[in-house]
């Protein structure tokens, strides 16, 4: 019967007594940077070309015996998970292996860098189809390794890496912390984060998604027909590399940004038990388990968006945090979140010719996060319209005045320390969909976009008194682009998007007392692109 | 265990070269930075990735590496250029004493230097 991990990533329409989705990634080459591998194992023979690249440190210890099967164990298993005949994800994908890890599974940042450079040079000498690079390894945070990954990604290569097995914030490790890399955490058959001895899968905002990574059956280097079960974020990353290979084989022109958005979009949502993660990491960690798209050709008509969290600002009075979208994504909205509730809002601003989302800490605050909503919107022309604090009037207003521009998000930023003592800011596009309304002492920022066929609407959901969390979701066919809170009292910790749901968090006021005036409303801006939908129908 | 100095066998004890005196001084106002792994057991002191500024050509990378060797030799230090990077990042990998970091950070075109560190199968 089909192994649990292959069943988990397979949409129901492919499920039979065996895993055989269409097109096994045959147009794609997957590079594996790992240990040596047993390339003629029955499961992978003819699928893996062992390059002559080898850059590994000496094994530790004077009495270390190089036993071939042990030296090949990790890499052989991963090659099998990616493209194995019987237990592989992308059965048609061809692979090339580079040896950067020694027989003890240890390598160096410099060896990995030279390996990545080798791949780039190979790509230049003999350009082929789409390339996926699998990095099933992790070390401490490395500026240079992250930089090399960024360069390779900008050259059109898709990099997939293990989040790390340290039960820790993946942002403390490389290449997991590189924003351009697709970073994968591990879950088990019960959709629980994987525990590995006293440690387990890494987590946090640097993880893009999770994938099966416990008791994964794959090729064993013990013999040419042997299989073995292994666990780890390497195995999880290998699943995503396989899924990426299949997606790219079906749509070879996909950019990295498009691929990442599709991986997120087609993932199983909200199935991971978040209680396993440290409390302060739960909101930052994506609750997504990778899966293949339900059809070979992905939903090109869809407006894809994802949520990007910044690093924590730190607690200083003037501290700020910045969240950035990938180069070919549009920042459609910006929100902020603070566990203490002490923040001074957020704003969208240009930095290096690109919009970024900046959140501001407030005096006495423990720090803030900026949350960017990053979307794929072809031919978009987006701008930010800002209204300075209105001071005297009832509130500050700003709208999208250009013809054909629609409102995709509202942000509010204030200089006063605590708006809770003032009339609360109101980001209220209601009634006038192209308008943001806010507190008279706040500057209000409207994200206004023009794109073919783009239409947006506002959805609100309010509850009489703050109850910790208020949500509002966009309906089927619409995509959440903006998420904000009404009102913005000191009770409100912030707003952020989780998949297609706008979440507004507020302090539990059972201890502080509340009034009906302090009702909290979650405001979602939901958009869709008729142009993309029409283009997709014409293709069919 | 093999002789730890084995790696140094091919080291070039670079003598002061004419080129050494001619190389450009580092640009004013830009200070190269040094980075190392926050996890102490994973550090590999003695090997450093010298990353040069983005538009640096291969010939400049090689020249900078040679200049480091020459200046180190003048101070009585052996260095070994293990690899010159080009294609992804401009720079070079050098085996040298940590005593030379201050000197290396002052070389022209240097953006930052990172001490090598371990990575592990996950």
């Amino acid at each position: 019967s089909i192994p649990w991990n292959l069943e988990r990533i397979t949409p129901p329409r492919y499920r039979a007594d065996e895993y055989q989705p269409p097109d096994g990634g045959s147009l794609v080459e997957v590079y594996l940077l790992d240990t040596s591998i047993q390339s003629d194992h029955r499961e992978i023979e003819g699928r893996v070309m062992v390059t002559d690249f080898e850059n590994v440190p000496e094994e530790d210890g004077t009495r270390f015996h190089r036993q071939a099967s042990k030296c090949d164990s990790h890499g052989t298993h991963l090659a099998g998970v990616v493209s194995g005949r019987d237990a592989g994800v992308a059965k048609g994908a061809s692979m090339r292996s580079l040896r950067v890890l020694n027989c003890q599974g240890k390598g160096t940042v410099s060896g990995t860098l030279i390996g990545l450079e080798f791949i780039r040079k190979s790509q230049l000498v003999q350009p082929v189809g789409p390339l996926v690079v699998l990095l099933p390894l992790a070390g401490g945070y490395s500026r240079v390794l992250n930089a090399a990954c960024q360069r390779l990604a900008r050259a059109g290569v898709v990099l997939v890496t293990a989040a790390g097995n340290f039960r820790d914030d993946a942002c403390l490790y490389s290449p997991a912390s590189a924003p351009e890399v697709i970073t994968v955490g591990a879950t088990n058959a019960q959709d629980q984060p994987v525990t590995l001895g006293t440690l387990g899968t890494n987590f946090g905002r640097c993880v893009d998604l999770f994938a099966p990574g416990e008791d994964i059956i794959g090729a064993s280097s013990d013999c040419s027909t042997c299989f073995v079960s292994q666990s780890g974020t390497s195995q999880a990353a290998a699943h995503v590399a396989g899924i990426a290979a299949m997606m790219l084989s079906a749509e070879p022109e996909l950019t990295l940004a498009e691929l990442r958005q599709r991986l997120i979009h087609f993932s199983a949502k909200d199935v991971i038990n978040e209680a396993w993660f440290p409390e302060d990491q739960r909101v930052l960690t994506p609750n997504l388990v990778a899966a293949l798209p339900p059809s070979t050709h992905g939903a090109g008509w869809q407006l894809f968006c994802r949520t990007v969290w910044s690093a924590h600002s730190g607690p200083t009075r003037m501290a700020t945090a910045i969240a950035r979208c990938a180069p070919d994504e549009e920042l459609l909205s910006c929100s902020s979140f603070s566990r203490s509730g002490k923040r001074r809002g957020e704003r969208m601003e240009a930095q290096g010719g690109k919009l970024v989302c900046r959140a501001h800490n407030a005096f006495g605050g423990e720090g803030v996060y900026a949350i960017a909503r990053c979307c794929l919107l072809p031919q978009a022309n987006c701008s930010v319209h800002t209204a300075p604090p209105a001071e005297a009037s009832m509130g500050t207003r700003v709208h999208c005045h250009q013809q054909g521009h629609v409102l995709t998000g509202c942000s509010s930023h204030w200089e006063v320390e605590d708006l809770g003592t003032h009339k609360p800011p109101v980001l209220r596009p209601r009634g006038q969909p192209n308008q943001c309304v806010g507190h008279r002492e706040a500057s209000i920022h409207a994200s206004c976009c023009h794109a073919p066929g783009l239409e947006c609407k506002v959805k609100e959901h309010g509850i009489p008194a703050p109850q910790g969390q208020v949500t509002v979701a966009c309906e089927e066919g619409w995509t959440l682009t903006g998420c904000s809170a009404l009102p913005g009292t000191s009770h409100v910790l912030g707003a952020y998007a989780v998949d297609n749901t706008c979440v507004v968090r507020s302090r539990d006021v059972s201890t502080t007392g509340s009034t009906s005036e302090e009702a909290v409303t979650a405001v979602a801006i939901c958009c869709r692109s008729r142009h993309l939908a029409q283009a997709s129908q014409e293709l069919q | 265990q093999e002789d730890e100095d084995g790696d140094y066998e091919e080291l070039v004890l670079a003598l002061r070269s004419e080129e050494d005196g001619l190389a450009e001084a580092p640009e004013h106002g830009t200070t190269a930075t040094f980075h190392r792994c926050a996890k102490d057991p994973w550090r590999l002191p003695g090997t450093y990735v010298v990353v040069l500024k983005e538009e640096t050509h291969l010939s400049q990378s090689e020249r900078t590496a040679r200049r480091l060797q020459a200046q180190a030799a003048r101070r009585g230090y052996l260095t070994k250029i293990l690899h010159v990077f080009h294609g992804l990042l401009p720079g070079f990998l050098v085996k040298m004493s940590g005593d030379l970091l201050e000197l290396a950070l002052k070389l022209p075109h240097v953006d930052y230097i990172e001490e090598d560190s371990s990575v592990f199968a996950q």
């Epitope: 065996e18 047993q38 390339s39 003629d40 023979e45 003819g46 893996v48 070309m49 059965k91 | -």
Partner: antibody, heavy 115, light 109 residues
């Protein structure tokens, strides 16, 4: 192009040994092992075993285990199959084929065991 | 006695379609994606026609197709031609080895 070239026909007496060679070319040798298959006159195909060109590991069919030895010489890209204690029912055409997938075959070597 | 069961012979007229079955168990055909089909003309080595149940190597006519259901694999030849007359063998992985079918003689009438 990908090729497997085998040694010539052999006539052996019962109890003797035979060693058939198979020279591989045109592909990365370590990406595939070599399978050996035999076919008795007028009969079907019988898989005898496999040898790794990567590390020399072998996987023999139970029926010939103990009588067969497969070896490789990586310097000449040649694989050998030696069958000992020959019997008359070992008379067959012996083929080498690439990997377990057996996508490329040698031309065959006829081994006749007769007293 | 071969591990996989094939009909001893099948026949068909030119232009017709024929199907050859190959029946095994859940330990071979049913348990793996690696069923292959070989064509063998007299005095020649076998030639791979189908691999991994339904894939055709380059150079093999698209008149040849493979499929599998449960423990039985099938080879279908459509638009039968005179040169298709040959012996056909199926093979499958087992947990540690390979097994062949006894072979099917295809006669083109």
């Amino acid at each position: 192009q990908v090729q497997l070239v085998q040694s010539g026909a052999e006539v052996k007496k019962p109890g003797a040994s035979v060693k058939v060679s198979c020279k591989a070319s045109g592909y990365p040798l370590t990406s595939y092992g070599i399978s050996w298959v035999r076919q008795a006159p007028g009969q079907g195909l019988e898989w005898m075993g496999w040898i790794s060109a990567y590390n020399g590991n072998t996987n023999y069919a139970q029926k010939v285990q103990g009588r067969v030895t497969m070896t490789t010489d990586t310097s000449t890209s040649t694989v050998y199959m030696e069958l000992r204690s020959l019997r008359s029912d070992d008379t067959a055409v012996y083929y080498c084929a690439r990997g377990y997938g057996m996508d490329v075959w040698g031309q065959g070597t006829t081994v006749t065991v007769s007293s | 006695q071969s591990a996989l069961t094939q009909p001893a012979s099948v026949s068909g007229s030119p232009g017709q379609s024929i199907t050859i079955s190959c029946t095994g168990t859940s330990s071979d055909v049913g348990g793996y994606n690696s069923v292959s089909w070989y064509q063998q003309h007299p005095g020649k080595p076998p030639k791979l026609m189908i691999y991994e149940v339904s894939n055709r190597p380059s150079g093999v006519s698209n008149r040849f197709s493979g499929s599998k259901s449960g423990n039985t694999a099938s080879l279908t030849i459509s638009g039968l031609q005179a040169e298709d007359e040959a012996d056909y063998f199926c093979s499958s992985y087992t947990s540690t080895s390979m097994v062949f079918g006894g072979g099917t003689k295809l006669t083109v009438l």
